[in-house]
Interface confidence: low
């Protein structure tokens, strides 16, 4: 670290003295202080010397000794007070400029430490600081208004006790200048228009920021507008606002706005998109599947999006049929508004009973007229056997009776033993039965059908199972045959003799 | 429907001024441009000048210094002064509402000839 | 002398297309939209095209605009007798920052 001669942190000497500080380091050392005149600069390899042999208040100030070689970066500094009875302030600089809430430095330096009791800041032609100023002295450096704000960019002097009078600086002008933090806050009212032909419509695009130097515009397909601007200022922000209106819209009025606004940070833009349209519309689609097939028990969310203007004047879900007079409870009915011209409805099923299959429709009205869309519900079921012996022209019948939805596909097994179910090793001969007979088959209902397994000779040590399945389940019934009849096993219940 | 309708008179001596006015009807004044657009006899269409309804104004710069335009929205009206006329000046003068691209005349008025003449 | 530049006269007859070209610079129809009026003989103009190549309501299909960087034109097909007129191309003019008129193209349906 280098050493200044003298070894003193402060040096106080009259005008016109002479004055030396000499700089000693282990290499090449350099002086640094504020700009002032009559200082003579002598070097000598690891020394230098700073003198003047006529000292001015103009000299008043901090002198800093470096070692640019120094890896450590060390300095030595020592203060000169020039005290001059006539001139109690050296200022530094006239202009200071500063962002909001940096600390701001007035380098106002005192010539006569013994003043510093007396100092005090204040605004050209002696008025006070504004209210909330909140600022520090140091004689050294000057003063500092503490985190500055933008409306206290003004004139100020310093001001020094000297023989009871007050004795005023030249006066340095605050600059503080606002923090942009980046391009102007945009809004673009609507997000999105549609108006029929001859209606009034308004667009309107704000601007605002924290500074006044900045520019908005209102483009049509990239044609810049030409609408008188109108700007205020409040919550500390500047605001621009070119408003749109058209007492009658045509068609050469539609498509895309933008809003454009610019400063030296740089530029930001919002778009919306403007339909004209001949008439009032109303659009109902889903993106379902018109026709739904569910599991009973299960649930359903049937969903519409509409879509329309002007807006809908009244909507209803309603319950078509074929089961039941019931409607659908408003409580299951939900509407979400997607924006201002979209929206989507959704009707809940939970837990589908079998009175609840059938066409549910969505009604919605607006000055465009009615649409409906109607959704297909159908349930589906797995299969329910039964199995019963009877005679068919002369000859003995099993008849397999299988009922769900889809149409079940129906299997006969026979097996050795009396059992409820045949498994794989028990089991002596298959019949698959491809197309059994259609019994019924309605809109909604489950379909029935009807399979025949035509038996010479009923075996009585063997079981005969018929298993009906489809993507839902699957359902059996095991008929047993015995000396005194025939019993049948329907699966998990009683034995049954007819 | 808008309509648009010019009145003023139809002779002016040379070095007056020529005074017109376009009364609107069927719709506002607000939220356009009103243009004035001549044409002189057996010529081109010349553009004047426009007046939004808050009274901010454009001229054509080869009229600038003769022309006035100003709007009186209570009445729905707009004017036109053309000042030191010559027989150059003699034209059928149109009132046109402009949507603000200023090039899209919309609706016109059916034009009155003015003849500068002493 | 019209910023514009249109041919004074064009012609054609009967279910022919006829093409009316309107010449201008950079400032004026490079830069901004061009609209084309028709005046029908002893009429105010009304409004063609807008926008470069936009009808309004009204305007039948037959009338079609186009521009190309600092040239647009004005395409009338299928021809009628009715469609004699003045036609005037115009634009923004953004160094006059004023509006700008072509000179004019009579058609003649012959």
């Known amino acids: 670290i280098p050493v200044i001669e003298p070894s003193v942190p402060e040096l106080v000497v009259k005008p016109g003295a002479t004055v030396t500080l000499r700089c000693v380091g282990n290499g090449s050392v350099e002086w640094d202080g504020p700009p002032s005149p009559h200082w003579t600069l002598y070097s000598d390899g690891s020394s230098s010397i700073l003198s003047t042999n006529n000292a001015t208040f103009q000299n008043t100030g901090t002198y800093r000794c470096t070692e640019p070689g120094d890896p450590l970066g060390g300095s030595a500094a020592i203060h000169l007070y020039v005290k001059d009875p006539a001139r109690p302030w050296n200022v530094l600089a006239q202009e200071v400029v500063v962002f909001e809430d940096q600390d701001a430095l007035l380098p106002c330096l005192l010539t006569d430490p013994v003043l510093e009791a007396g100092v005090s800041l204040v605004r050209v032609r002696g008025r006070p600081l504004m209210r909330h100023t909140n600022y520090s002295f140091s004689p050294w450096h000057g003063f500092t208004i503490h985190r500055a704000k933008f409306i206290q960019s003004q004139d100020y002097q310093c001001s020094a006790l000297m023989g009871g009078r007050k004795v005023m600086s030249i006066s340095i002008r605050l600059k503080v200048q606002k923090v942009i933090p980046g391009p102007p806050a945009l809004t673009l009212v609507p997000a999105e228009l549609v108006r029929i032909r001859g209606e009034a419509a308004q667009i309107v695009c704000s601007a605002s920021s924290v500074d006044v130097n900045f520019d908005v515009f209102l483009q049509h397909n990239n044609t810049k507008l030409a609408i008188p601007q109108q700007s205020d200022f409040h919550n500390n922000r500047y605001q621009k606002v070119l408003t749109l209106n058209l007492d009658q819209v045509d068609f050469q009025h539609a498509g895309n706005y933008s809003c454009v606004a610019s400063n030296v940070q740089g530029k930001h833009s919002t778009s919306m998109f403007f339909r004209v349209v001949e008439s009032a519309y109303l659009n109902l689609s889903s993106e379902q599947n018109l026709i739904q097939e569910v599991t009973v028990g299960e649930g359903l969310n049937l969903k519409v999006m509409v879509e329309a203007y002007p807006g809908l004047q009244g909507f209803n879900w309603t319950y078509l049929g074929p089961f039941s007079d019931h409607q659908p409870e408003p409580k299951l009915a939900n509407a979400t508004t997607k924006d201002t011209y979209r929206h989507t409805f959704t009707l809940s099923l939970p837990r589908l009973k079998p009175s609840e299959a059938g066409r549910y429709s969505f009604l919605a009205r607006n000055p465009g007229g009615w649409r409906a869309l109607t959704f297909e519900l159908t349930l589906r079921y797995p299969p329910e056997v039964s199995v019963i012996w009877t005679f068919i022209n002369g000859s003995g019948t099993l008849l397999c009776a299988a009922s769900g939805y889809p149409q079940p596909n129906v299997t006969w097994l026979q097996c050795s033993g009396h059992t409820d179910r045949c498994d794989e090793a028990q089991v002596l001969q298959v019949w698959d039965d491809p197309y059994p007979e259609v019994l019924s088959q309605e809109p909604f209902h489950k379909v029935t059908v009807q399979s025949l397994l035509t038996v010479e000779t009923l075996e009585h040590n063997q079981t005969y199972e018929c298993r009906a399945h489809n993507s839902v389940g699957s359902g059996s019934w095991a008929f047993i045959p015995i000396s005194a009849g025939a019993h049948t096993h329907p699966p998990d219940e009683f034995l049954f003799t007819p | 429907q808008v309509q648009l309708q010019e009145s003023g008179p139809g002779l002016v001596k040379p070095s007056e001024t020529l005074s017109l006015t376009c009364t609107v009807s069927g719709g506002s004044i607000s939220s356009y441009y009103w243009s004035w657009i001549r044409q002189p006899p057996g010529k081109g269409l010349e553009w004047i000048g426009y007046?939004?309804?808050?009274?901010?104004?454009n001229y054509n710069p080869s009229l600038k210094s003769r022309v006035t335009i100003s709007v009186d929205t209570s009445k729905n009206q707009f004017s036109l002064k053309l000042s030191s006329v010559t027989a150059a000046d003699t034209a059928v003068y149109y009132c046109?509402?402009?949507?603000?691209?200023?090039?899209?005349?919309?609706?016109w008025g059916q034009g009155t000839l003015v003849t500068v003449s002493s | 002398q019209s910023v514009l530049t249109q041919p004074p006269s064009a012609s054609g007859t009967p279910g022919q297309r006829v093409t009316i070209s309107c010449s201008g610079s950079?400032?004026?129809?490079?830069?901004?939209?061009v609209y084309w009026y028709q005046q029908l003989p002893g009429t105010a103009p009304k409004l063609l095209i807008s926008?470069?190549?936009q009808r309004p309501s009204g305007v039948p299909d037959r009338f079609s605009g186009s521009k190309s960087g600092t040239s647009a034109s004005l395409a009338i097909s299928g021809l009628r007798s009715e469609d004699e007129a003045d036609y005037y191309c115009a634009a923004w003019d953004d160094s006059l920052s004023g509006v700008v008129f072509g000179g004019g193209t009579k058609l003649t349906v012959l």
């Open positions: 950079s400032s004026n129809i490079g830069s901004n939209y």
């Open positions: 046109a509402r402009g949507w603000w691209e200023l090039t899209f005349f919309d609706y």
């Open positions: 926008s470069n190549n």
């Open positions: 007046i939004y309804y808050t009274g901010s104004t």
